[in-house]
């Protein structure tokens, strides 16, 4: 059941030539690093998880989403200092008692070996070698991502 | 003080021709509505503020940032129902005892006339006619934004 504003929006949009969509990110903005089909930005400063999420959002990007173990390893290879921790887009959902990516999907238990507790106010950080559960209030660095590949007619389904 | 990874990233990027930056959003993706130099997406579903922030982020967008009263009015004109509330990217910072946009800037007190309390766990919603402080846990709709204007050499300073 759509509101009139949503119907209107859909009508306006569907009357367009749909090939005039966002051309995607053709190459990475300055200061961002390319890793396969993504651009990554490793922060210089520190923030709690929530502020890190907000920072990525205002950069029109997302806290890092990691698809599988292979992507984790390739990301960790970019981290030069063993002791530095970076927030990624994964935190503990108390209501669902599970690790949840910020895109709404749940963690496949085989993907990451998390060190630490799965409990309220826990968020996930990565280092050069490991994946850690930390209090979300901990102030550490973070990683933002942008999708690199040009996408035509990219539709964003409502979550 | 930059880490080796960041120095490396800067070196790689600066050696490029800087005109090969992201071309920006040439027009709005399907389902998004154009409002001046922005694309807006009004959600169909409901979420607490934090999940709304995460949703916009995974869409490589931001919760709505409103520059001034004029932009507020133009946004409100797109809302058809007087009672429906939409989260925007503004919440109460307890440590700074002030309303703070997710981009880190503080609210100019003249911009929005907020109805309700300025206190911990308060986030800002807009309706067709007003601006309200609500508990951040309240599950309402939300508005994501993408900047529309093509920008060359867009640099994202670390917050």
């Amino acid at each position: 059941q759509k509101s009139s504003i949503e119907k209107c929006s859909v009508d306006i949009q569907q009357s367009r030539n749909k090939t005039t969509e966002r051309p995607g990110l053709l190459n990475c903005p300055i200061y961002w690093q390319q890793l396969r089909e993504k651009c990554l930005l490793f922060s210089h400063t520190v923030n709690p998880w929530n502020n890190s999420l907000a920072d990525c959002s205002t950069k029109e990007s997302s806290l890092l989403l990691i698809r599988d173990k292979d992507e984790l390893i390739h990301t960790q290879n970019l981290i030069r200092d063993k002791a530095i921790l970076f927030w990624i887009g994964l935190n503990f959902s108390l209501s669902e008692k599970n690790w949840k990516w910020i895109n709404g999907s749940f963690l496949n238990s085989n993907d990451l070996e998390i060190r630490g507790d799965a409990k309220e106010n826990s968020c996930i950080s990565i280092s050069q070698t490991s994946v850690y559960s930390e209090y979300c209030s901990t102030e550490i660095r973070w990683i933002c991502q942008k999708e690199l590949t040009p996408v035509r007619n990219k539709v964003y389904p409502d979550s | 003080q930059k880490s080796s990874i960041e120095k490396c990233s800067v070196d790689i990027q600066q050696s490029r021709n800087k005109t090969t930056e992201r071309p920006g959003l040439l027009n709005c993706p399907i389902y998004w509505q154009q409002l001046r130099e922005k694309c807006l997406l009004f959600s169909h579903t409901v979420n607490p503020w934090n999940n709304s922030l995460a949703d916009c982020s995974t869409k490589e967008s931001s919760l709505l940032l409103i520059r001034d009263k004029d932009e507020l009015i133009h946004t409100q004109n797109l809302i058809r129902d007087k009672a429906i509330l939409f989260w925007i990217g503004l919440n109460f910072s307890l440590s700074e005892k002030n309303w703070k946009w997710i981009n880190g800037s503080f609210l100019n007190s003249n911009d929005l006339e907020i109805r309700g309390d300025a206190k911990e766990n308060s986030c800002i919603s807009i309706s067709q006619t007003s601006v309200y402080s609500e508990y951040c846990s309240t599950e309402i709709r939300w508005i994501c934004q993408k900047e529309l204007t093509p920008v060359r050499n867009k640099v994202y300073p670390d917050s």
């Epitope: 059941q1 209501s95 | 579903t45 409901v46 607490p48 007087k82 009672a83 429906i84 509330l85 939409f86 109805r115 309700g116 919603s125 007003s130 609500e134 508990y135 846990s137 309240t138 599950e139 309402i140 709709r141």
Partner: antibody, heavy 122, light 108 residues
Framework: QVQLVESGGGLVKPGGSLRLSCAAS????????MSWIRQAPGKGLEWVSY????????AYADSVKGRFTISRDNAKNSLYLQMNSLRAEDTAVYYC???????????????WGRGTLVTVSS | DIQLTQSPSSVSASVGDRVTITCRAS??????LAWYQQKPGKAPKLLIY???ELQSGVPSRFSGSGSGTDFTLTISSLQPEDFATYYC??????????FGGGTKVEIK
């Protein structure tokens, strides 16, 4: 069609328990704040409890706090009210009601069930 | 808790009459007010929300006004199907969500 159907009412002795259910259909149940509202015979309306769409936020009227528990199962499109330590003054028709979507905790009840009668008497 | 006082408690009117019911809140509630119609043995029906917004499918002879503490429901031209009890309800974001005592609209 869009509807709410309550069940589970009946006669119960003071101190007893009942569990009311409300089956929702015809709309996306998981997007709505849901409430229980009651009406004693010949009297006015009294809001009892609400639950947020995700189930994360719950509130109760003082008259039932500590005795009644609201819950929901979005997968089953169902709302529940567990009523314990029932008293004679809990006798009423109990309505399941949906709030207008996206008005948050400003609850306007736009869809009601037909109600189920709970009688507490010895 | 916010108390709502409706007046009158009952009103006798004829078909075609203009009927006005008032609702006063014990403290300011901005525009967070609704009006419902209830017929005997039936569930209430939402007529007006946000003080003045007409709910979808409700005839335009019903209208609402007011903000703060004083609110009014007006039926511009009473129809036979409008004889019922009417309740106001405050919808500030803090429970409890109180209802007024009701106004019975009867046939004169």
């Amino acid at each position: 069609q869009v509807q709410l159907v309550e069940s589970g009412g009946g006669l119960v002795k003071p101190g007893g328990s009942l569990r009311l259910s409300c089956a929702a259909s015809g709309f996306t149940f998981a997007n709505y704040y849901m409430s229980w509202i009651r009406q004693a015979p010949g009297k006015g309306l009294e809001w009892v409890s609400y639950i947020s769409p995700s189930g994360a936020t719950i509130a109760y009227a003082d008259s039932v706090k500590g005795r009644f528990t609201i819950s929901r199962d979005n997968a089953k499109n169902s709302l529940y009210l567990q009523m314990n330590s029932l008293r004679a003054e809990d006798t009423a028709v109990y309505y399941c009601a949906r709030s207008l979507m996206a008005t948050g905790t400003h609850l306007y009840f736009d869809l009601w069930g037909r109600g189920t009668l709970v009688t507490v008497s010895s | 808790d916010i108390q709502l006082t409706q007046s009158p408690s009952s009103v006798s009117a004829s078909v075609g009459d203009r009927v006005t019911i008032t609702c006063r809140a014990s403290s300011g509630i901005s525009s967070w007010l609704a009006w419902y119609q209830q017929k005997p043995g039936k569930a209430p029906k939402l007529l007006i929300y946000a003080a003045s917004e007409l709910q979808s499918g409700v005839p335009s002879r019903f209208s609402g006004s007011g903000s703060g503490t004083d609110f009014t429901l007006t039926i511009s031209s009473l129809q036979p199907e409008d004889f019922a009890t009417y309740y106001c309800q405050q919808a500030t974001s803090f429970p409890p969500y109180t209802f007024g005592g009701g106004t019975k609209v009867e046939i004169k």
